[in-house]
Amino acid sequence: NKILVKQSPLLVVDSNEVSLSCRYSYNLLAKEFRASLYKGVNSDVEVCVGNGNFTYQPQFRSNAEFNCDGDFDNETVTFRLWNLHVNHTDIYFCKIEFMYPPPYLDNERSNGTIIHIKEKHLCHTQSSPKL
């Protein structure tokens, strides 16, 4: 019995900061959970993770390469990433695991969210020379 997750298919970022919401088909407040965000087609890199339950606000911690924080309500976990660079452009997957009380539950792999970090170009207005 797997939980479904909904993610936005694409987020285009030009401010070096993004919020990615993961909406689950399960009440987060029912059990103790571990919510995480993975980067890459094979979910190779765990970007951000938070443990939570109905009695305490989770502490989110990030991979050394990322800055992250998060928040949740009864059906959504939102990851906030900042100081993003062009090379962070990739596909990101939401994951949730419900540990206690048993039984263990996790989500079906979603289609992910492509986060596209736009390169910042310095624009110099070219003034035409006076004749």
Epitope: R34, E97, M99, Y100, P101, P102, Y104
Partner: antibody
Amino acid sequence: EVQLVESGGGLVQPGGSLRLSCAASGFSLSTSGVGVSWIRQAPGKGLEWIGEIYHSGSTYYSPSLKSRVTISRDNSKNTLYLQLNSLRAEDTAVYYCARYGYYYYDFDYWGQGTLVTVSS
Amino acid sequence: DIQLTQSPSSLSASVGDRVTITCRASQSVDFHGISFLHWYQQKPGKAPKLLIYAASSLQSGVPSRFSGSGSGTDFTLTISSLQPEDFATYYCQQSYRSPRTFGQGTKVEIK
């Protein structure tokens, strides 16, 4: 047949570290449906849960040991590891790995245990 | 943490006796009608062995003289007719919350 075999026990100096192994056979540590815990038992005492690892690689630890313990695994060897740092005399115990199912989290298979003695 | 208190801590009994061990949890270990409370038997120098899971389900291969009952916070392990191989220490364990905890054990000795 499911089997768990611990190794790596022995005499360790206070302040030192231990790394125990638990070789699993008859099931895969990375297949959904089962996880493995480490549990210890001091001489003549009861059972104490140390922590666990799920098929996903997620870990949970006992709050009393969290700052000193790491549970990891090598999927290619189907082996689980327990690293415990800053050892003290009270860490002297038989260390067991035990498998649990995802529905009830009951420990249905146990290793034979490995004895760790912390002494100078 | 959920505390589990077993009673008695030890008991002496004879072969053929009916033996009852109780386990009391500091809070309910029930969720959606399931009690996440399990019973194990341990003999000297050996690893524990699962007897009863989810309060009352008999583990495969365990003799039917072992039974479990209870819900919420109060649980019982019963051995209907004690056999020579049953002299051992018995532990209850909860898996409702992390950290998982065990009772302190009940040693069943020969009278």
